[in-house]
Amino acid sequence: LTCLGGFASPGPVPPSTALRELIEELVNITQNQKAPLCNGSMVWSINLTAGMYCAALESLINVSGCSAIEKTQRMLSGFCPHKVSAGQFSSLHVRDTKIEVAQFVKDLLLHLKKLFREGQFN
């Protein structure tokens, strides 16, 4: 077989699959957590019913040097239609409470599981 350079582009991941993969990654993080996640870093809590994916990314992107959540950050960047940079907060983001990354991940996971059960893949 001859390699013609590059890889065949995989088909787009259906929203249901993308959501399931994110849930699996968050489960992985919570189950493998030994020491405090991201050294106990604090992030802004978000309204999980309002523009959740971009808001979650805007919060988590401010955590740097934490390999445990890098894959989650990458996945969430694909879930948001606009580019998110550290220090950026959209109008959907209410910055009033900070919580530990571990708690943020647990809250996000519970909400995503609920959405998945209800078949809300949008």
């Epitope: 787009p12 991941v13 929203p15 993308a18 959501l19 019913t49 309002a50 523009g51 959740m52 994916y53 971009c54 960047s77 694909g78 879930f79 239609p81 606009h82 580019k83 940079s85 950026q88 959209s90 109008s91 959907l92 078949g119 809300q120 893949f121 949008n122």
Partner: antibody, heavy 118, light 109 residues
Framework: EVQLVQSGAEVLKPGATVLISCKVS????????MHWVQQAPGKGLEWIGR????????KYAPKFHDRVTLTADTSTDTAYMELSSLRSEDTAVYYC???????????WGQGTLVTVSS | QAVVTQEPSLTVSPGGTVTLTCRSS?????????ANWFQQKPGQAPRTLIY???NRAPWTPARFSGSLLGGKAALTLSGAQPEDEAEYYC?????????FGTGTKVTVL
């Protein structure tokens, strides 16, 4: 002033490949996702996909994923859309557009008309 | 894949009010669909009116407003002007891709 200037109209035969460029000015392309939209004559808008020019990461609409390739050159602030295996139903105007939260799809290229005809 | 449906055409009197809706085949539209509304006139590129469900673009007149209404995204035009006659499209984000609506032709008559 923000501007997106696209390459000129193309007339191509079925089976050919087209490459459309979108040269931006007034902003740095790597700071934004660039989206591409198709509009066939007298028809509605159809989202093709988007690219993060900073790392080349792409998302494609299911309809286009096997024939379209989005790329970007951050050194020249230019985004590209390549569509292969052209067929008559690909005859359309193709737009590039900048997307960010505070002005999604606020800036559009002038459109590039691609005509596929034998 | 989801289908996003709009009313094919609507007519409004000058000064009147009309509401355009954007329905998702997969269920209720939410703020995580980041609904966008566009106006397009013949021979022109689309122009964003509303983004993120209910935020007006800087150039959007106050007579246009966006909302969620009965599980659909909605665009309300209050006090229609002759220049508002155009095609209107919505676009919804589905986790990793946009889908545009079928479009609504608004006639001001």
């Amino acid at each position: 002033e923000v501007q997106l200037v696209q390459s000129g109209a193309e007339v191509l035969k079925p089976g050919a490949t087209v490459l459309i460029s979108c040269k931006v000015s007034g902003f740095t392309i790597k700071d934004y996702y660039m989206h591409w939209v198709q509009q066939a004559p007298g028809k509605g808008l159809e989202w093709i996909g988007r690219i993060d020019p900073e790392d080349g990461e792409t998302k494609y609409a299911p309809k286009f994923h096997d024939r379209v390739t989005l790329t970007a050159d951050t050194s020249t602030d230019t985004a590209y859309m390549e569509l292969s295996s052209l067929r008559s139903e690909d005859t359309a105007v193709y737009y590039c557009t900048r997307y960010d939260y505070y002005g999604p799809f606020a800036y559009w290229g002038q459109g590039t008309l691609v005509t596929v005809s034998s | 894949q989801a289908v996003v449906t709009q009313e094919p055409s609507l007519t409004v009197s000058p000064g009147g009010t009309v509401t355009l809706t954007c329905r998702s085949s997969t269920g209720a539209v939410t703020t995580s669909n980041y609904a966008n509304w566009f106006q397009q006139k013949p021979g022109q590129a689309p122009r964003t009116l509303i983004y993120g469900t209910n935020n007006r673009a800087p150039w959007t007149p106050a007579r246009f407003s966006g909302s969620l209404l009965g599980g659909k995204a909605a665009l309300t035009l209050s006090g229609a002007q002759p220049e508002d006659e155009a095609e209107y499209y919505c676009a919804l984000w589905y986790i990793n891709h946009f889908i545009f609506g079928t479009g609504t032709k608004v006639t001001v008559l």
